[in-house]
Interface confidence: low
């Protein structure tokens, strides 16, 4: 899988990251998971291994398979909801994943990041760093 | 065959937690979903949440986020529901499905004081 | 939430009438529709899955069709073991919504 290394939102906006995989990993689950550890992260969201989107709570996932591209959407970001997150597919045998670093800057803080030009609180991510983890 | 086996009725006082547990047998436990539906007395069905045995992800529908939930342990393919600060609304047969293609036999939690 | 709708609520019907009962999403749901019959004091049992597929094992007298936003579940020849309350369901969007059901009473 790619996707970014570390992504910055601000405080109450959103954020999207989008993480790529390979062929043939069209229809495994996909899934958006929170923590240090990667066996032992909790998983927020996860797809059907359709292209169907699924939301829970503030977070969202999609899946594009004909792109081999799932985005997922973190809305009215809190300050702890910087953390590590995970990227991750599953399969049979070890899940595929990337690290993703999530930075929330607080409210009213300057933030580095290029906004979306429709909404100045939502910031996307396609990964201008990326790193494989396969 | 495949076969989806709940734990018993419970009574419980409102503000408890009741945990039910649902046993399966007869497929590969972590190759499918397993929800978790619930019927109030003469009502439809509702939907809770899924968990997926393999990854241990779980979806809950929001009304019930942050009071439910559902667990698994691969070695005896048991997965569990945990509905907390219980209230007399929550009196309802509660289901496992698996996927919802198989149904376990129910469950009935009665919450009174 | 995706809201399901279903009509009638209830319907008496003799043995050997065609029963048709339509469900009705809020929203495009495409074909992700899920048709489900019950009796007193069972669980649910699948029937059509993906708006017109036929579970394994189900009789071939239930047929369902529809996308989008319409739905129907039709049984072409009523047995007396099909009196029961059926519902729809949709599995599009979490959360995933049953319809109110349709009880299918004896004449």
């Known amino acids: 899988i790619q996707g970014p290394e570390s992504v910055r939102a601000p405080e109450q906006g959103s954020l999207t990251v989008q993480c790529h995989y390979k062929q043939g990993w069209e229809t495994y689950i996909k899934w958006w998971c929170r923590g240090v550890r990667w066996d032992t992260c909790k998983i927020l969201i996860e797809t059907r291994g359709s292209e169907q989107g699924e939301k829970s709570d503030r977070v969202s996932i999609k899946d594009n398979q004909k792109d081999r591209t799932f985005t997922v959407t973190m809305e009215g970001l809190r300050r702890d909801d910087a953390d590590v997150y995970w990227c991750g597919i599953e399969r049979r045998g070890p899940d595929l994943g990337t690290q993703v670093k999530v930075i929330v800057d607080p409210e009213g803080a300057a933030s580095t990041t290029a906004s979306s030009p429709t909404n100045s609180n939502m910031a996307v991510f396609i990964g201008s760093h990326k790193r494989n983890h396969y | 065959q495949v076969q989806l086996v709940q734990s018993g009725a419970e009574v419980k006082k409102p503000g408890a937690s009741v945990k039910v547990s649902c046993k399966a047998s007869?497929?590969?436990?972590?190759?499918?979903?397993m929800h978790w539906v619930r019927q109030a007395p003469g009502q439809g069905l509702e939907w809770m949440g899924w968990?997926?045995?393999?990854?241990?992800?779980?979806i809950y529908a929001q009304k019930f986020q942050g009071r439910v939930t559902m667990t698994r342990d691969t070695s005896t393919s048991t997965v569990y529901m945990e509905l907390s600060s219980l209230r007399s609304e929550d009196t309802a047969v509660y289901y496992c499905a698996r996927d919802l293609d198989y149904w376990g036999q129910g469950t009935l939690v009665t919450v009174s004081s | 939430d995706i809201q399901m709708t279903q009509s009638p609520s209830s319907l008496s019907a003799s043995v050997g009438d065609r029963v048709t009962i339509t469900c009705q999403a809020s929203q495009d749901i495409s074909n992700y529709l899920n048709w489900y019959q019950q009796k007193p004091g069972k669980a649910p049992k699948l029937l059509i899955y993906g708006a017109s597929s036929l579970q394994s094992g189900v009789p071939s007298r239930f047929s369902g069709s529809g996308s989008g936003t319409d739905f129907t579940l039709t049984i072409s020849s009523l047995q007396p073991e099909d009196f029961a309350t059926y519902y729809c369901q949709q599995s599009y969007s979490t959360p995933w919504t049953f319809g109110p059901g349709t009880k299918v009473e004896i004449k």
């Open positions: 968990i997926n045995p393999n990854s241990g992800g779980t």
């Open positions: 007869g497929y590969t436990f972590t190759n499918y979903r």
